[in-house]
């Protein structure tokens, strides 16, 4: 029999550490799964934000310009209509995500930066101007938010929360990277992460999760965006690359 | 097409108010703030104000607050310009416009 | 508020002429400065827009320039149908407000 679970691999049954895990999942539940993405834009130059009223300019990184955020945001829509099969029945991320406020708002916690814009190509285009100015646009609603995640209106002219569909903030740093201090607006990656439900001793609702993350593979190794390099993983990644180096050996 | 289609001309006797409009087509007033520009004959142009339709939110140039209303109804895609207590000095083209893109004009006449 | 000023208030030239009408902000606008032509009975047209940038369908002849409080736009080798009054305008924020014009006549 070959071992690959990551937790049976790298820690002794009979350990403190394997113990006091035991005892947590037992009494608390697993730790939730976590598919991640890292999104870079290679192909896109950093760029100013002037605002409004004579403000010093502010830097927006490459993966925080406006045509890119949209098209993050149609990736990240597609990942949550990836769908998979487990004993004939229809796996959806919506059927094993993370949603804390349950049953009164069913929404998946996405932590992404597209959820200051409560992940909504209408919202991120919501601006006040006329054709010549703009005083207030995603720029602005932006830097609002990676300083206030938890607010309900950003006080510019926009009004618009920060608050993510799932009823909850979104801290700047786990969305964002290659940031400097706390200047988020340099961020030079963006990071998408879906929390998914883990189960203690309950192996189908385990492989539901897995055949999800399997698509989930799937779809974003062959998908196709020139303006985008994505790196990824599944909670399922180390195990699939310990079964691989398995069968290789 | 982007297009604004101002009013007819008015023909109105001093003390008395009027409302000008002004229908886009080719998009949504509210995607835009919207300007009000005046023109005596044979002067400049100075602006009057402007409305965001989203909210109704407005400002205006002090010289023209009490004088000068300026509405939305986002249903009709139409901004509106009332002017009040029209004088001799209200006797001007008055343009709509969202930057890029004006009205035609309409000519307000005030005489008794 | 900002206020423009423009200059000269006329000017007659010929056809094939270049002219220079200049424009002065009384505080930084930046680049935030449009040209428009207007001729008689006519609404404005825009000609330029953040101080330098053509608007649609406007000839190359016209350019704008200049960033800050000074700014200018010219036209090179006048056509007939080039002749009218030019306003600047400043388009940081608002109030808008409008240079008092220059009418440019056939020499």
């Known amino acids: 029999r070959v071992t690959t679970n990551p937790v049976d691999l790298w820690s002794a049954p009979s350990s403190q550490a394997r113990l006091e895990k035991e005892y947590f999942d037992q009494h608390f539940g697993p730790f939730f799964r976590t598919e991640q993405l890292i999104i870079r834009a290679p192909l896109t130059d950093k760029h100013i934000y002037q605002p409004y009223p004579s403000g010093a300019d502010v830097p927006f990184g490459p993966p925080l310009d406006i045509q890119i955020l949209h098209q993050v945001l149609d990736l990240q829509i597609a990942i949550e209509n990836i769908t998979a099969s487990y004993d004939n029945e229809t796996v959806t991320l919506q059927d094993i995500c993370l949603a804390p406020l349950s049953p009164y708002n069913t929404n998946c916690t996405i932590l992404s930066v597209l959820n200051y814009f409560q992940n909504s190509h209408s919202v991120l285009d919501h601006k006040k101007g006329d054709d010549f100015f703009v005083y207030a646009d995603y720029h602005t609603h932006f830097l609002y938010c990676v300083r206030a995640p938890a607010s309900l209106n950003d006080t510019s002219l926009l009004h618009d929360p920060c608050l993510g569909t799932f009823g909850g903030p979104v801290f700047p740093w786990l969305v964002l990277g290659g940031y400097d201090d706390q200047n988020y607006n340099n961020a030079t990656a963006l990071v998408i992460t879906f929390p998914v439900n883990n189960y203690y001793n309950d192996t189908e609702k385990l492989q539901r999760a897995q055949a999800w993350e399997k698509e989930f593979i799937n779809f974003v190794k062959n998908y196709k965006n020139p303006n985008l390099t994505i790196s990824f993983t599944a909670e399922r990644s180390i195990e699939d690359e310990l079964n691989r180096e398995s069968d290789s050996d | 097409e982007v297009q604004l289609q101002q009013s007819g001309a008015e023909l109105v006797k001093p003390g008395a108010s009027v409302k000008l409009s002004c229908t886009a087509s080719g998009f949504n007033i509210k995607d835009t703030y919207m300007h009000w520009v005046k023109q005596r004959p044979e002067e400049g142009l100075e602006w009057i104000g402007r409305?965001?339709?989203?909210?109704?939110?407005?400002e205006y140039v002090p010289k023209f607050q009490g004088k000068a209303t300026i509405t939305a109804d986002t249903f009709s895609n139409t901004v509106y310009l009332q002017l009040s207590g029209l004088t001799s000095e209200d006797t001007a083209v008055y343009y709509c416009s969202r930057g890029y893109y004006w009205g035609q004009g309409t000519t307000l006449t005030v005489s008794s | 508020d900002i206020q423009m000023t423009q200059s000269p208030a006329s000017l007659s030239a010929s056809v094939g002429e270049t002219v220079t009408i200049t424009c002065r902000a009384s505080e930084n606008i930046y680049s935030y400065l449009a040209w428009y032509q207007q001729k008689q009975g006519k609404s404005p047209q825009l000609l330029v827009y953040n101080a330098k940038t053509l608007a649609e369908g406007v000839p190359s002849r016209f350019s704008g320039s200049g960033s800050g409080t000074q700014f200018s736009l010219k036209i090179n080798s006048l056509q007939p149908e080039d002749f009218g009054i030019y306003y600047c305008?400043?388009?940081?924020?608002?109030?808008?407000?409008f240079g008092g014009g220059t009418k440019l006549e056939i020499k």
């Open positions: 409305i965001d339709p989203a909210d109704g939110n407005t």
């Open positions: 305008q400043h388009h940081y924020g608002s109030p808008w407000a």
